[in-house]
C-alpha cells in the first residue's frame, strides 16, 4: 500500500525531518508551507492552520521560497551613472549596471554599488588594457614609432606614418608630418586596433564614448585624494 | 527542556578546543535551530554561529568568525559542538549555547530571533 | 552586516521609576527579527521580549517593548530592586546573499 501523503500542517516523524518547500515551525511544532517567490508569510502556521501567504508589496519582492514576515525592500533606483537592467518585480530586485563609459569600481551580489568613469588616455599614451564591465583601463607609454594624439578611453597608440622626406619627425603625442610625396604606413610591432570595451549585458553592445569633459577617474562618492594613474588625465 | 555546555578550558594561544551543547527534554535533531554566543569577562554578547538541525542543515557565522569556527551536529548524541582553532586571548570568554524559539527563512537562510532557553556557559581562558 | 547600537550605555533610576532603553539597528529591520534580553552578573541571559512587542513568558507586564524599522525601544515601569541589569536587544534581517543577525552593546541598569 502506498504511504499516506501528509498535509500540511503535519507532526514530522520523530527525528524526520520536513519535506521540500516546507519548514519546521518552532511555535506549532509542526511542518507548513513555504512561501513562493513574489509572497510572504502573512500569518504563520498553528497546529490546525497552514502559513496564509500574501502578495509582496510595492517596491518589495521575493526571489526564493521562503517563511519570512516581510518581503525584501528592493534597491534604490539607479544612479545616473547607471543602467537599470531589471525592474523591481514582487519576485525580483532591480538590477543597476553602469552606462557605457563607466565600469563598476565596487559591485554587489547583482549590479553594481558604484560606477567610475573609465580612465582616458592622455596624448602620448594609449590604451594598453581596455576596460572591462569591472575594470578600469591601463594606459601605457607610447612606444618608439608610436603615438597617440586623443585624450581617449579607448586609443591605442598608432603607428608613425613613414615619410618618404620628414617635414616635422613624430613622437609620442603626434604623428610625423611628411612633405608633398604621399605617405606610408608603417605596422609597428603590437599596433593592433583594440575595440571598445562591451558588456556582457545585451543593453550595453552598442557602447557610446563619455563625454571628454568629465575627469579620469570620477565617483560618485567622495573618496580620499589620490594621485592620477601614468597617462591618464588628472587635474 | 534545557542546554549545558561542556569543554571549557584554559589552553595555550595557538590551541584548538571543541565545546559541545547537550540538549534534554527535546531533540536537537528535529529542526532546532541552534546557536554559540560567547561573552567576553565585563563585555557584551557576541554571537558566533548558528545551524538549522533540521533538513536544510544550513549554518551561519558571523563575519568575523568564519574560518576559525566550526559548528556541526552529532545526530546520535543530541548535540551541538563548536570547534575553535588558533586560539588567541581575545577568545578568553564565556561560552554560551541557545535555542532560537523563532525561525524565520528565505531560501536556503534562516534567522533564529528570541533565544530561549541558553545554558549557563562554559568559560574558555586562552593564556601562556 | 547589521549593527545594532544601544543607548545609554548606563542608566541609574530609582526603585518605582522608569528606565527607557533605546536600541538602534543599522538598517531597517522587521519588528519581528527584534528581541530583548536580560542578564544578571554570572547568569545567563534570560529573553524578555520578542518581535520587538511580545512578551515571554513569566515576564511581567511592567517591561514594555515598542518601535519599528530602525528605531526600537524597551521600557521598564514601577522598577524593582531585582531590575537590575544588562539589558541586551538583538536583531537581524534577510538580503538575497545571507542573513544577518547580531546583539547590541548592551544597557546597564541600576537601581538606587
Known amino acids: 500500500l502506498p504511504a499516506q501523503v501528509a498535509f500540511t500542517p503535519y507532526a514530522p516523524e520523530p527525528g524526520g525531518t520536513c519535506r521540500l518547500r516546507e519548514y519546521y515551525d518552532q511555535t506549532a511544532q509542526m511542518c507548513c508551507s513555504k512561501c513562493p517567490p513574489g509572497q510572504h508569510a502573512k500569518v504563520f502556521c498553528t497546529k490546525t492552520s497552514d502559513t496564509v501567504c500574501d502578495s509582496c508589496e510595492d517596491s518589495t519582492y521575493t526571489q526564493l521560497w521562503n517563511w519570512v514576515p516581510e518581503c525584501l525592500s528592493c534597491g534604490s533606483r539607479c544612479s545616473s551613472d547607471q543602467v537599470e537592467t531589471q525592474a523591481c518585480t514582487r519576485e525580483q530586485n532591480r538590477i543597476c549596471t553602469c552606462r557605457p563609459g563607466w565600469y563598476c569600481a565596487l559591485s554587489k551580489q547583482e549590479g553594481c554599488r558604484l560606477c567610475a568613469q573609465l580612465r582616458k588616455c592622455r596624448p602620448g599614451f594609449g590604451v594598453a588594457r581596455p576596460g572591462t564591465e569591472t575594470s578600469d583601463v591601463v594606459c601605457k607609454p607610447c612606444a618608439p614609432g608610436t603615438f597617440s594624439n586623443t585624450t581617449s578611453s579607448t586609443d591605442i597608440c598608432r603607428p608613425h606614418q613613414i615619410c618618404h622626406v620628414v617635414a616635422i619627425p613624430g613622437n609620442a603625442s603626434m604623428d610625423a608630418v611628411c612633405t608633398s610625396t604621399s605617405p606610408t604606413r608603417s605596422m609597428a610591432p603590437g599596433a593592433v586596433h583594440l575595440p571598445q570595451p562591451v558588456s556582457t549585458r545585451s543593453q550595453h553592445t552598442q557602447p557610446t564614448p563619455a563625454p571628454s569633459t568629465a575627469p579620469g577617474t570620477s565617483f560618485l562618492l567622495p573618496v580620499g585624494p589620490s594621485p592620477p594613474a601614468e597617462g591618464s588625465t588628472g587635474d | 527542556q534545557s542546554l549545558e555546555e561542556s569543554g571549557g578550558d584554559l589552553v595555550q594561544p595557538g590551541a584548538s578546543l571543541t565545546l559541545t551543547c547537550t540538549a534534554s527534554g527535546f531533540s536537537v535533531n528535529v529542526n532546532s535551530y541552534m546557536c554559540w554566543v560567547r561573552q567576553a569577562p565585563g563585555k557584551g554578547l557576541e554571537l558566533i554561529a548558528c545551524i538549522d538541525t533540521g533538513s536544510g542543515g544550513s549554518t551561519w557565522y558571523g563575519s568575523w568568525a568564519k574560518g576559525r569556527f566550526t559548528i556541526s551536529k552529532s545526530t546520535n548524541l543530541n548535540t551541538v559542538t563548536l570547534q575553535m582553532t588558533s586560539l588567541t586571548a581575545a577568545d578568553t570568554a564565556t561560552y554560551f549555547c541557545?535555542?532560537?524559539?523563532?525561525?524565520?527563512?528565505?531560501?536556503?537562510?534562516?534567522?533564529?530571533?528570541?533565544?530561549?532557553?541558553w545554558g549557563p556557559g562554559t568559560l574558555v581562558t586562552v593564556s601562556s | 552586516d547589521i549593527v545594532m547600537t544601544q543607548t545609554p550605555a548606563s542608566v541609574e533610576a530609582a526603585v518605582g521609576g522608569t528606565v527607557t532603553i533605546k536600541c538602534q539597528a543599522s538598517?531597517?529591520?522587521?519588528?519581528?527579527?527584534l528581541s530583548w534580553y536580560q542578564q544578571k552578573p554570572g547568569q545567563r541571559p534570560k529573553l524578555l521580549i520578542y518581535q520587538a512587542s511580545t512578551l515571554a513568558s513569566g515576564v511581567p507586564s511592567r517591561f514594555k517593548g515598542s518601535g519599528s524599522g530602525t528605531e526600537f525601544t524597551l521600557t521598564i515601569s514601577d522598577l524593582e530592586c531585582a531590575d537590575a541589569a544588562t539589558y541586551y536587544c538583538?536583531?537581524?534581517?534577510?538580503?538575497?546573499?545571507?542573513?544577518?543577525?547580531?546583539f547590541g552593546g548592551g544597557t546597564e541598569v541600576v537601581v538606587k
Open positions: 538598517q531597517s529591520i522587521s519588528s519581528t527579527y
Open positions: 541557545a535555542r532560537a524559539r523563532n525561525t524565520y527563512g528565505y531560501g536556503d537562510y534562516v534567522y533564529g530571533g528570541a533565544f530561549d532557553p
Open positions: 538583538q536583531g537581524g534581517y534577510f538580503s538575497d546573499n545571507g542573513c544577518y543577525n547580531a
